[in-house]
Amino acid sequence: ELCDDDPPKITHATFKAVAYKEGTMLNCECKRGFRRIKSGSPYMLCTGNSSHSSWDNQCQCTSSAARNTTKQVTPQPEEQKERKTTEMQSQMQLADQVSLPGHCREPPPWENEATERIYHFVVGQTVYYQCVQGYRALHRGPAESVCKMTHGKTRWTQPQLICTGETEPSQFPGEEEPQASPDGLPESETSR
């Protein structure tokens, strides 16, 4: 069941999921100057069964200038640079290789994808928070939020995290210290 709203906002923090539960939608958003092709789903869907899950539908962006120059998903290395891919992101994607039954990994980027990924999460999804670069995490408890169903309504638990001061960003679960992370978490790996 789809969560009614988005995970809580924490000042100076971003969040991401390590894996996405079946039923999760990822909107096919394109960067400025590009738009989603007119045929095809407006989102990708994490779908499958208990043994194997994958993203259904593929996002494709085309130039807003009338010419129909649609290109297929996987971007070239120079285009990946344009999407501010950092070493930290690739470390996260390695962490995502761990297969959880009934979950999908982070989908690969598509060409001319928007800088921010917009997910519609489902009940039971956990997202993990970290402070953006330049802010230090003060933990009063777990820096995570879970979408729960209570009395027929969905709600996100409040992450016990405050981001303050000057220091390196903290990490998501199961990740090693990155060698270099000039940008911290790329925007494309977050949702507001």
Epitope: G23, M25, K38, D56, I118
Partner: antibody
């Protein structure tokens, strides 16, 4: 709590135009497309088009090109639809919808009558 | 444009029964189909997305199925509050289109 609050009922003259609003609350307005849907008794639901408030991209159903115009004001998280050259065929309830059609406004009834 | 046909405009059922509302697309739409419930004087309420996934708060007696061109919304153990009109919608390609609706009447 995510809400789409639409403006009130309109009674308008044929040949004039009308502008209705849809105010979003409880989510990041610029992240999600806002769609508009027309409902007339006996005609079911008709998708008019949608607008992305973040980049002001629009898509229009061919049947409504020249009839409907979408705009968005990010400062007030409000989307507008203007309908022009109104005729009795435009008398209907108009709904706004967002978050991949999960959320719907309460509808704005429009009556075109002389 | 893709045409969605809900062949039954009216369906009559009794409380506790099981009823299936069907929707046929004029071309393949994958699983990019949603179902809505509309009660008199209200705006449509989203029930199902991607053919078979329920929105939050939707009772599990509502089940969606199908892919390609044939889709079904099944209501098991029908309740009196299910009296409403049910619409299918495709969002596989622009313009998005809706079925003509099926009115569920409770005997």
């Amino acid at each position: 709590q995510i809400q789409l609050q639409q403006s009130g009922a309109e009674l308008v003259r044929p040949g004039t135009s009308v502008k209705m609003s849809c105010k979003a609350a409880g989510y990041t307005f610029t992240n999600y497309w806002i769609g508009w849907v027309k409902q007339r008794p006996g005609h079911g639901l008709e998708w008019i088009g949608d607008i992305h408030p973040g980049g002001s991209y629009t898509n229009y159903n061919e049947n409504f090109k020249g009839k409907a115009t979408f705009t968005a004001d990010t400062s007030s998280s409000t989307t507008y639809m203007q309908l022009s050259s109104l005729t009795s065929e435009d008398s209907a309830i108009y709904f706004c919808t967002s978050r991949n059609f999960a959320k719907w406004g309460q509808g704005t009834p429009v009556t075109v009558s002389s | 444009d893709i045409v969605l046909t809900q062949s039954q405009k009216f369906m009559s059922t009794s409380v506790g029964d099981r009823v299936s509302v069907t929707c046929k697309a004029s071309q393949n739409v994958g699983t990019n189909v949603a179902w809505y419930q509309q009660k008199p004087g209200q705006s449509p309420k989203a029930l199902i997305y991607s053919a078979s996934y329920r929105y939050s708060g939707v009772p599990d007696r509502f089940t969606g199925s199908g892919s390609g061109t044939d889709f079904t919304l099944t209501i098991s153990n029908v309740q009196s509050e299910d009296l409403a009109e049910y619409f299918c919608q495709q969002y596989n390609s622009y313009p998005y289109t809706f079925g003509g609706g099926t009115k569920l009447e409770i005997k």
